[in-house]
């Protein structure tokens, strides 16, 4: 109507999807009687009657709002339940008397989108792409109104930048009226972006104010050419023969290039390619001194066939050569002297030690061992150990056996053996001397002889226990060019009272052994007299 005052701005009512909107008719008593009101929805400038109030009683009109409207607050407020995005429109109430006035309410509807779903480019991005390449996508589902997306790199928001950063977004309306926002970040990346963290953020509004949701952070596979190639050796530090050594070729490109490792040949002055495993690693196991030398790595870009060469790396596999001892097989008379000399080569300074084989006692620190006034007991093993003190575990040894000339020397002079009549007895007798003695027995039986070492012999006799044998006992005699010596084994019948409580009669009585080693090595439990210390 010309001259009529401009309509006031509608009252704003904000509500979340699914909740109830309370539409309060703001007509004053002078503007109309609230017991007689018509409610309309306005959509695309078209009014539709949705609710009538008569004498304070409400009545829904047929249509989309029929089931969702009710009166509250003594008829002054219309409640709209289960609000949907389609309800975002103007509602107006119109009083009937004294003259027709209306009050307008703008309903604004909100819904937080779901957590943003970020997906990174699974194939990666080369740094030399001609234009911005797709880095990641972000999807925010079921929000209202359309949320805003912001992309971040390392915590900083990304802005559109010509030929560098491009953000492309679109939205679709679901059947529910909610929006799904889709966004793709395109960017030209550089090598430094290989560790960059990207994420997307959705900004949206609710009746309570502005809010945001962030996606998880992702990193993008970034491909960049190799600029530098180098070799790494494991283990680090001093290497020694016998170690497992890995020579690995490394490059700063992604994906790694194809590698080959070569070793310089000092005689031909040419590099010879080494055989690497599937990962391009050269494994030396066990490492030998021949593996020492100059290694280098060549990296090939199979796309461009450009190759890069690493700095050469010297590999030193430390070693100790075979140890030589002179004299190699020493023989001496009792009372004489002997000088043993030890030699070896190494890539490092060597230390020598002489040890007695039987006791591991250190006799000398140095390559020369001098022995004076040699006794029979001096016969046996001497070990020279050549070691590199700076490299634990790098050592070699050589054993030399010293023989002292002398007549046979018995392990025992006499011994008592408990037996049972008619049992088969296993007797043993041990003697040493140089030259090596032979052993004979004074009774018939099955004898077998075995060398313990070049100067020592052990003879075993299987014999049936007879009354005559019990009476005479058994003698073993050892002889060599320098003399002879005898041991006597006295046989004594066992009875139950002579057996110890822990005896095992079956084994004890069937395999009696008359050897000085019985205590340590035999399962025999026959009782023995204490061993005499005399050595004949």
């Amino acid at each position: 109507v010309p001259g009529e005052a401009e309509q006031p701005a509608p009252e704003l009512v904000e509500v979340e999807v699914g909740s109830t909107a309370l539409l309060k008719c703001g007509l004053s008593q002078s503007q109309g009687n609230l017991s007689h009101v018509d409610w309309f929805s306005v959509h695309k400038e078209k009014r539709t009657l949705i609710f009538r109030v008569r004498q304070g009683q409400g009545q829904s009109e047929p249509g989309e709002y029929e089931q969702r409207l009710s009166l509250q607050d003594r008829g002054a407020t219309l409640a709209l339940t289960q609000v949907t995005p389609q309800d975002e429109r103007i509602f107006l109430c119109q009083g009937k008397r004294p003259r027709s006035q209306e009050y307008r309410i703008q309903l604004r509807v909100y819904k937080a989108p779901e957590e943003p779903n970020i997906q990174v480019n699974p194939l990666g991005i080369p740094v030399n792409s001609k234009e911005p390449e797709e880095v990641a996508t972000c999807v925010g589902r079921n929000g209202y109104p359309i949320p805003q997306v912001i992309w971040y790199k390392n915590g900083r928001p990304l802005k559109e930048e010509k030929n560098r950063v491009h953000i492309q977004s679109s939205q679709t309306v679901e059947s529910s009226g909610l929006y799904t926002l889709q966004s793709i970040l395109k960017a030209q990346l550089v090598k430094e972006d290989k560790d960059a963290q990207f994420y997307c953020e959705l900004n949206y509004r609710l009746p309570s104010g502005n809010h945001m949701k962030e996606s998880r952070e992702v990193t993008v596979p970034v491909f960049y050419p190799t600029e530098k190639v180098w070799l790494e050796v494991e283990p680090v530090g001093m290497l020694k023969e016998g170690d497992r050594v890995e020579i690995r070729c490394l490059a700063d490109g992604n994906p790694p290039p194809h590698f080959s490792i070569s070793k310089g040949n000092p005689s031909t002055r040419e590099a010879e390619e080494e055989t690497t495993n599937d990962n391009g690693v050269l494994v030396l196991e066990p490492a030998r001194k021949e593996h020492s030398g100059r290694y280098e790595c060549q990296a090939w870009n199979l796309d461009t066939m450009i190759s890069l060469l690493s700095e050469p790396q010297e590999l030193l596999v430390n070693y100790v050569s075979d140890v030589r001892v002179s004299p190699a097989a020493p023989e001496r008379q009792e009372g004489s002297s002997l000088t043993l000399t030890c030699e070896a080569e190494s890539s490092q300074d060597l230390e020598f030690q002489w040890l007695r084989e039987e006791t591991d006692q250190v006799l000398e620190r140095g390559p020369v061992l001098q022995l004076h006034d040699l006794k029979r007991e001096a016969g046996g093993g001497y070990r020279c150990v050549a070691s590199v003190p700076s490299i634990p575990g790098l050592n070699r040894t050589q054993l030399v056996k010293l023989a002292i000339f002398g007549p046979p020397w018995m392990a025992f002079k006499e011994r008592k053996v408990w037996v049972k009549e008619n049992m088969v007895l296993n007797l043993s007798c041990e003697a040493s001397g140089h030259p090596r003695p032979t052993i004979s027995w004074n009774v018939n039986g099955t004898a077998s002889e075995g060398d313990q070492d070049p100067q020592r012999v052990l003879s075993t006799l299987n014999v049936l226990v007879t009354p005559e044998l019990l009476e005479t006992g058994v003698e073993c005699t050892a002889s060599n060019d320098l003399g002879k010596n005898t041991s006597i084994l006295f046989l004594e019948l066992v009875n139950l009272t002579t057996l110890t409580p822990d005896s095992n009669t079956t084994t004890g009585l069937s395999t009696s052994t008359a050897s000085p080693h019985t205590r340590a090595n035999s399962t025999s439990t026959e009782r023995k007299l204490p061993e005499p210390e005399s050595r004949g």
Epitope: E134, T137, S170
Partner: antibody
């Protein structure tokens, strides 16, 4: 509507080179990437190669040295070449469009069966 | 490379049945997973993307769930046209497909 159609030889000899063409319509190769996926008879799907909307090429490392993928945006075509063909390469070869806002394949060609035999 | 293992490799069911197909990734792929349906002599058709989003035009009886390494495709009430082979595919690092699950009529 979006369509993709594969074309190329149905039979190739061992050691020969296979060239397949994917002709697309209903979208632009500068807005969607295209992949090649193959399926040997009675077996599973296997991704071979891709070209992005920006023109970047990607290959399955199992075949990389034998593959080449390229495109002609004016003809709306993507071309795959695979050298040194072997009977184990006998398969149905599909081209597929990558969804613009995701990394899955939303449209596929009907596929072309390539047999490698002497 | 990420391996995708589907189970079962085949299953028999009747119209109206509720069916689940499982897919296991050899490492965490978050929700970078799609499900495809393939009928004999036809190209695959995407059903589900981002592990649980239904592709436009796909009936709501299809649903996807899971995250990380374990994923499931569920068909709530089998229809005659659903008998086919189903593949899962990861797109977290490169592209790899499961070996397929053949769904047959009992």
């Amino acid at each position: 509507q979006v369509t993709l159609k594969e074309s190329g030889p149905v039979l190739v000899k061992p050691t020969e080179t296979l060239t397949l063409t994917c002709t697309v319509s209903g979208f632009s190769l500068t807005s969607n990437g295209v992949s090649w996926v193959r399926q040997p008879p009675g077996k599973a799907l296997e991704w071979i190669a891709a070209i992005s909307s920006g023109g970047t090429t990607y290959y399955n490392s199992a075949f990389k040295s034998r593959l080449s993928i390229s495109r002609d945006t004016s003809k709306s075509q993507v071309v795959l070449t695979m050298t040194n063909m072997d009977p184990v390469d006998t398969a149905t070869y599909y081209c597929a469009r990558r969804y613009g806002y995701g990394w899955y394949f939303d449209f596929w060609g009907q596929g072309t069966l390539v047999t490698v035999s002497s | 490379d990420i391996q995708m293992t589907q189970s079962p490799s085949s299953l028999s069911a009747s119209v109206g049945d509720r069916v689940t197909i499982n897919c296991k990734a050899s490492q965490n792929i978050y929700n970078s997973l799609a499900w495809y349906q393939q009928k004999p002599g036809k190209a695959p058709k995407v059903l589900i993307f981002n592990a649980n989003s239904l592709q436009t035009g796909i009936p709501s009886r299809f649903s996807g769930s899971g995250s990380g390494t374990d994923f499931t495709l569920t068909i709530s009430s089998l229809q005659p046209e659903d008998f086919a082979t189903y593949y899962c595919q990861q797109f977290y690092s490169g592209y790899t497909f499961g070996q397929g699950t053949k769904l047959e009529i009992k």
